[in-house]
Interface confidence: medium
């Protein structure tokens, strides 16, 4: 009896010999993998961090994007409201300008947009001439050109190209006994203006001016005592109307 | 460059004549108005007749009636016959060629001259 309970004692303990071995085999496993798991967890950490940290470097960005949007949307009421505004100044200026204009026209005449002379004045090509009515010496006839923004004229729009001188007649009152008229022509050949200081000078020392004289349909440039009374001949440069 | 060369000039006696010529060279004579100026001394030159490309003439009021002035463009020839001569009338008269394409442009000839005695 004795016997057989230790036989089947060690057989029993041989048996869990044999568990004990199988199971201590399969905790050991399950320790290679646990220790697995670990590292495979930690490194699903890290990468968590990792799109963690990503994902606030996204949202700092979006947000930071997003506060441009608002600046920006933010400027372009802005813009608006001024393009608006100033949509309604420069309206409000064309009207102004419109009525200047309307006012301005009677003292105006044109020929183009390009080519204006105030009113009173005759207008040859692109140039714009003032007959004087009142006769004035040399000195004062210039500066009376002066005063209105001319020079006493040289024709210099019209010489010397040919038949100038159907221009100067229609330009000019007709008379058979004769027509002087001040004017800035020089008695050089080329009958350029002379200069503020060639013309003192000339003034000063012979006293003798230069006018353009009519007689019948001819014109001379004549000289004459500068301070002769004669009516006079103021010349501009015709101009775009005012815009 | 034009020339012009007057001839005719003289003394003559108070309601006599005398014929002025004028001979141009050097440019198309048809182109050109031509007159006659005169100069008194101690006077400004005047323009005592004209006539113009179109034969169309001028008489200053002193000389209408009494002075013509003629063209023959086949002779490059400006004429003044003078009539009825006075006192007054004594000057040089100087024959003008005007361009009239260039109105500032006068040519002139060295003149005659015409002196009436009474």
């Known amino acids: 009896r004795y016997l057989q309970v230790s036989q089947q004692l060690q057989q029993t303990n041989r048996v869990l010999e044999v568990t004990n071995s199988s199971l201590r085999q399969q905790l050991r496993l399950k320790i290679t993998q646990l220790g697995q798991s670990a590292e495979d967890l930690q490194g699903s950490r890290r990468e968590l961090a990792q799109s963690q940290e990503a994902l606030q470097v996204e949202q700092r960005a979006h947000q930071a994007a997003e506060g441009q949007l608002q600046a920006c949307q933010a400027d372009r009421q802005k813009t608006k409201e001024t393009l608006q505004s100033e949509e309604q100044q420069r309206r409000a200026l064309e009207q102004k300008l419109s009525n200047m204009e309307n006012r301005l026209k009677p003292f105006f005449t044109c020929g183009s947009a390009d080519t204006c002379c105030p009113s009173g004045w005759i207008m040859h090509q692109k140039s714009c001439f003032y007959i004087s009515l009142t006769s004035k010496n040399w000195q004062e006839s210039q500066k009376q050109c002066e005063t209105l923004s001319s020079k006493l004229a040289t024709f210099s729009e019209i010489y010397p190209q040919s038949h100038s001188y159907y221009f100067l007649n229609s330009l000019l009152p007709n008379g058979g006994s004769g027509n002087s008229y001040w004017t800035g022509l020089s008695s050089n050949k080329d009958w350029k203006l002379t200069d503020d200081t060639q013309r003192t000078r000339t003034y000063a020392q012979s006293s003798k001016c230069n006018k353009v004289h009519k007689t019948w349909s001819w014109w001379t440039l004549e000289s004459e005592s500068c301070r002769s009374s004669l009516p006079y001949i103021c010349e501009m440069t015709a101009f775009r109307f005012p815009d | 460059q034009v020339q012009l060369q007057e001839s005719g000039g003289g003394l003559v006696q108070a309601g006599g004549s005398l014929r002025l010529s004028c001979a141009a060279s050097?440019?198309?004579?048809?182109?050109?108005?031509m007159g006659w100026y005169r100069q008194a001394p101690g006077k400004e030159r005047e323009l005592v007749a004209g006539i113009d490309t179109g034969a169309n003439t001028y008489y200053a009021d002193s000389v209408k009636g009494r002075f013509t002035i003629s063209r023959d463009n086949a002779k490059n020839t400006v004429y003044l016959q003078m009539n009825s001569l006075k006192p007054e009338d004594t000057a040089v008269y100087y024959c003008?060629?005007?361009?009239?394409?260039?109105?500032?442009?006068?040519?002139w000839g060295q003149g005659t001259q015409v002196t009436v005695s009474s």
């Open positions: 003008a060629a005007h361009d009239d394409g260039d109105p500032w442009h006068v040519y």
């Open positions: 050097g440019t198309i004579f048809d182109w050109y108005s």
